[in-house]
């Protein structure tokens, strides 16, 4: 049978650390981290770290009992947690029977937005108390709500990360631009800006609160040539206030009456957090 890992929390030092070991397994060959989206019972999503590691291919893995992974997170407050992953079998070969190094992974450390994490891993039994043991570490900075994984975090969803306003904007005449967009059930106040190098027009939009998505339309007076200008739609949802995710589109010429409105290929480009 091939070894697998069984992982569980281990907050204090590993018991092996207190024992003297004549020989210890070598260090890890590789350590990687990426955020992954996992579904939870409530139908919500949880973003966790997928920590994967590769074992060095030599006879020292015969001594390997476990690998310990510790994560320190630094944002508004500091967090620290460790897991110990025990190998279910002794290693009978230095590489997988199908070829390639032994590779394992653990999914479980929660990932917060825009946080710097320090991930360290070492093999057990590790070096003796007064010796420097081989270990591997890396830094991982979690992205914000615009990331394709992080956008599923509850805080991001409440800031409109999953909302696609499907913006269309067209120049009606030299003085006005018509902006259409799909509203969000998250809120009813929006700001639409038209800008080239500077802001050439804007309008506040307030729609009646609705639990469903509807199309809103606003005609915005502009002070300059608007064709090719950028439209920026900023929502003001109660959950994120002025820190909600902006969306962008481009102004095109309005079609002739009776011709279908052309979809703007640049619609709903993710913007960022408002400064």
């Amino acid at each position: 049978r091939e070894p697998t890992v069984q992982c569980g929390s281990e907050t204090g030092p590993s018991p092996e650390w207190m024992l003297q070991h004549d020989l210890t397994p070598g260090d890890l060959r590789d350590l990687r981290v990426e955020p992954v989206k996992t579904s939870v019972a409530t139908g919500d999503y949880s973003i966790l770290m997928n920590v994967s590691w590769v074992l060095r291919a030599d006879a020292s893995i015969r001594l390997l009992k476990a690998t310990k992974i510790c994560v320190t997170g630094k944002s508004n407050f500091q967090s620290y947690s460790c897991v110990r992953c025990n190998y279910t079998e002794a290693f009978q070969t230095q590489t997988r029977p199908s070829g390639g190094k032994w590779t394992f992974s653990y999914i479980g450390f929660p990932v917060e937005l825009n946080t710097v994490y320090f991930i360290g891993a070492h093999n057990i039994p590790n070096a003796n108390m007064n010796e420097d043991g081989p270990s591997m570490s890396l830094n991982f900075t979690s992205p914000g709500c615009l990331d394709h994984i992080m956008k599923y975090k509850k805080k991001c969803v409440k800031a409109g990360s999953l909302w696609d306003p499907n913006i269309t904007a067209c120049k009606k005449n030299e003085e006005t631009v018509e902006v259409n967009f799909t509203t969000s059930p998250l809120g009813n106040r929006y700001m639409a800006l038209i800008q080239h190098s500077t802001i050439i027009g804007f309008s506040q939009v307030s729609e009646p609160y609705q639990n469903k998505q509807t199309r809103a339309s606003v005609v915005i007076p502009v002070t300059e040539e608007s064709e090719g200008a950028m439209v920026q739609l900023t929502p003001y949802f109660p959950t994120c206030g002025s820190d909600c995710i902006r969306h962008k589109g481009t102004v095109v010429l309005c079609p002739q009456t009776g011709v279908p409105f052309p979809l703007d290929n640049n619609r709903s480009k993710p913007g960022g957090w408002l400064p």
Partner: antibody
Framework: QVQLVQSGAEVKKPGASVKVSCKAS????????MNWVRQAPGQGLEWMGR????????QYNQKFKDRVTMTRDTSISTAYMELSRLRSDDTAVYYC???????????WGQGTLVTVSS | DIQMTQSPSSLSASVGDRVTITCRAS??????LAWYQQKPGKAPKLLLY???NLADGVPSRFSGSGSGTDYTLTISSLQPEDFATYYC?????????FGGGTKVEIK
């Protein structure tokens, strides 16, 4: 059955390079490390390094690190060892040897005699 | 690097003799040791690995023992085809090294 078949004998001048091939058959090439071991006339065995055909990871004996290059071509299940800047004391039989579960050498090629002479 | 010291470097023995070859590692190799037999003009042949495990097709008169740094290869009853040179090798992590060899000759 497992077979490792090496390229033929070579005569080289000092300063030249030699490339020895080792064609594997009878097993899944990417599943085991391939080692290179040399033996000078009347001398013992000397490990030069190893390559993992799965991902081309290489570990060299420091003694040869600057002069040896190990490669592989998985499409033809062949490993290669190139030794550059040859000297007369590189005259030896060069063997490829496949690792077992760990790095005991379960199968050996027939050997390739490389003679370095001016 | 781990040094492997083999002794004796050569020995003379007769058919039927019990022959013992020793191999000492410069540090603990945790029983990661193999023995090879080599005949003139031929590639080495694996005899034992992990100290005591016989490789495929190797006669049971060959046996191995030892742990830590000291290891022994024993041929219980020497046969004519056993006259050859024997090498030990550690595989406790690269670089792998061999003993200097023991030549077993006919007395």
């Amino acid at each position: 059955q497992v077979q490792l078949v090496q390229s033929g004998a070579e005569v080289k001048k000092p300063g030249a390079s030699v490339k020895v091939s080792c064609k594997a058959s009878g097993y899944t090439f990417i599943s085991y490390w391939m080692n290179w071991v040399r033996q000078a006339p009347g001398q013992g065995l000397e490990w030069m390094g190893r390559i993992d055909p799965y991902d081309s990871e290489i570990q060299y004996n420091q003694k040869f690190k600057d002069r040896v290059t190990m490669t592989r071509d998985t499409s033809i299940s062949t490993a290669y060892m190139e030794l550059s800047r040859l000297r007369s004391d590189d005259t030896a039989v060069y063997y490829c040897a496949r690792s077992g579960g760990f790095d005991w050498f379960a199968y050996w090629g027939q050997g390739t005699l490389v003679t370095v002479s001016s | 690097d781990i040094q492997m010291t083999q002794s004796p470097s050569s020995l003379s023995a007769s058919v039927g003799d019990r022959v013992t070859i020793t191999c000492r590692a410069s540090e603990n190799i945790n029983s990661n040791l193999a023995w090879y037999q080599q005949k003139p003009g031929k590639a080495p042949k694996l005899l034992l690995y992990d100290v005591t495990n016989l490789a495929d097709g190797v006669p049971s008169r060959f046996s191995g023992s030892g742990s830590g740094t000291d290891y022994t290869l024993t041929i219980s009853s020497l046969q004519p085809e056993d006259f050859a040179t024997y090498y030990c090798q550690h595989f406790w992590g690269p670089p792998y090294t061999f003993g200097g060899g023991t030549k077993v000759e006919i007395k």
